[in-house]
């Protein structure tokens, strides 16, 4: 998630939205400016063609494996479960995502030549694929519980519901996603290359944190409180009941939901901390911002490369994903029949298991 | 990389007039504040006067009608015309600029840094 960062963050930030020109020096003068050492913004140096390779590649393995994803479950019509629509949807959002890194790339060596419209564009997919990915997997926890620790599945096998509830996310996405909408914009300077960044003008420090605050707290703390709540009772049942089959089920599904924690919780709580010191609740040093600055470029790193992780999570533990393409790839005649497994269909979805599905 | 460099400090007699430039170059996005301060040995460094990107000026009450600080924001750079000098006024001059520069690998975040020049001599003295 970007960054979500309201980062045109003058001295006015300090002092809560207060005008600077009209403060009376005759007081004492904070810190910062008394303080001879100056205070010079750092991260992490890193050469720019090493970024644009690191883009080429998660480009390449996320277009390839998410295109691949979403092509098998749309083949599956017939035995498609609620979770592998909600896969479907994460499918999605990792491509939009993935097919912004060549412009990212790009403007990594010739600076931001696309202009406002596709600065907002780009970082408002970005931030959409991180939204959509922890509220779907939010979702397919709840899926989970209700089909393993209640045994119903009333509530998510209506069809409706669930495109429903899929839109809906969506929409909250982007909803969470408009500040990066409403203050991305390309800057011109007459000293570097242009460059899409959040420019918040003269909003006040009050509103700026506002604006981080909730899509921080709605976008990433509930969902994974709710993951944490489901997964939590969905475990216990499993290995209480000594449900080996569902167990096995439910691998694939653990895997995306750590691989996702390992990728963007790092980010995340160096984004809190930020917020925390933007909000005074932690003392704001130089020190600790350069710390925060170099942690969030360390972390970041890793959310990128989360859209390209799933297929390969699919492709490695998901024997129903693997039946699933080896099933496409024999319908058009790119390899042999004979070769495609006995217990082979075109779907994620194994064996049915009282009420839930071995997906993947 | 970012760097302010002074110039026009040096010896002048009492009621003499030096003026003193400050250029900043790098890669700078914007500059919001700059300002000279000055400081004599054994004291802290003061502020002298500082000016705002909108054109705001701020002096302190010892250099008022004497000091004028204007700056130029098409070369980045602020400038200290000191008029009337006085002994109290030797220090080293130190200019000071609140930078917004840009920071990051992955996505750029616009940061603002508190800048310092190395500090240039002024010796009012007869």
């Known amino acids: 998630m970007e960054d979500f960062n309201m980062e045109s963050d003058s001295f006015e930030d300090f002092w809560k939205g207060e005008d600077l020109s009209n403060y009376s020096y005759s007081s004492t003068l904070p810190p910062f400016l008394l303080d001879a050492a100056p205070c010079e913004p750092e991260s992490l140096e890193i050469n720019k063609y090493f970024v644009v390779i690191i883009y080429a590649l998660v480009f390449l393995l996320s277009l390839l494996g998410n295109s691949l994803v979403m092509l098998v479950i749309l083949y599956s019509r017939v035995g498609r479960s609620v979770t592998d629509v909600y896969l479907l949807n994460l499918a999605l959002a990792d491509l939009l995502f993935a097919l912004t890194l060549p412009i990212w790339a790009a403007s990594k060596v010739n600076g931001w030549i696309f202009g406002t419209f596709l600065c907002k564009v780009v970082s408002l997919l970005k931030e959409v694929n991180f939204y959509s990915g922890i509220l779907l997997l939010a979702c397919i926890s709840v899926d989970r519980y209700l089909a393993i620790v209640h045994a119903t599945r009333t509530l998510t096998q209506k069809r409706y519901l669930v495109k429903f509830i899929c839109l809906s996310i969506w929409g909250l996405s982007l909803l969470l996603a408009l500040p990066v909408l409403l203050f991305r914009r390309t800057v011109y300077s007459s000293n570097v290359s242009p460059a899409c960044y959040e420019d918040m003008g003269n909003n006040t420090a009050n509103w700026r944190m506002l604006l981080r605050i909730l899509p921080q707290s709605f976008g990433f703390i509930v969902p994974l409180l709710i993951m944490l709540f489901c997964y939590g009772f969905t475990l216990r049942t499993l290995f209480k009941a000594h449900m080996g089959q569902k167990h096995r089920a439910m691998r694939v599904i653990f895997a995306v939901v750590l691989i996702f924690l390992l990728c963007w919780l790092p980010y995340n709580l160096v984004l809190l901390a930020d917020t925390l010191m933007r909000t005074q609740v932690i003392q704001e040093t130089c020190e600790r911002r350069n710390h925060i600055d170099r942690a969030l470029d360390a972390t970041e790193i890793l959310g990128i490369l989360h859209s390209c992780l799933n297929p390969l999570i699919y492709a490695f533990i998901g024997q129903k994903f693997r039946h699933g393409l080896l099933k496409i790839l024999a319908i058009h005649g790119l390899i042999s029949k004979d070769s495609l497994p006995k217990d082979s269909r075109p779907s994620f979805v194994g064996s049915s298991s009282g009420h839930t599905s071995t997906t993947l | 990389e970012v760097q302010l460099v002074e110039s026009g400090g040096g010896l002048v007699q009492p009621g003499g007039s030096l003026r003193l430039s400050c250029v900043a170059s790098?890669?700078?996005?914007?500059?919001?504040?700059m300002g000279w301060y000055r400081q004599t040995p054994g004291k802290q460094r003061e502020l002298v006067a500082d000016?705002?990107?909108?054109?705001?000026?701020n002096y302190i009450d010892a250099v008022k009608g004497r000091f004028t600080i204007s700056r130029d924001n098409t070369k980045n750079t602020v400038y200290l015309q000191m008029n009337s000098l006085k002994p109290e006024d030797t220090a080293v001059y130190y200019c000071?600029?609140?930078?917004?520069?840009?920071?990051?690998?992955?996505?750029?975040?616009?940061?603002?840094?508190?800048?310092w020049g190395q500090g240039t001599q002024v010796t009012v003295s007869s």
């Open positions: 000071n600029a609140e930078i917004v520069v840009l920071v990051g690998v992955w996505t750029q975040r616009a940061r603002t840094g508190n800048y």
């Open positions: 790098g890669s700078i996005v914007r500059i919001n504040t």
């Open positions: 000016i705002t990107s909108g054109g705001n000026i």
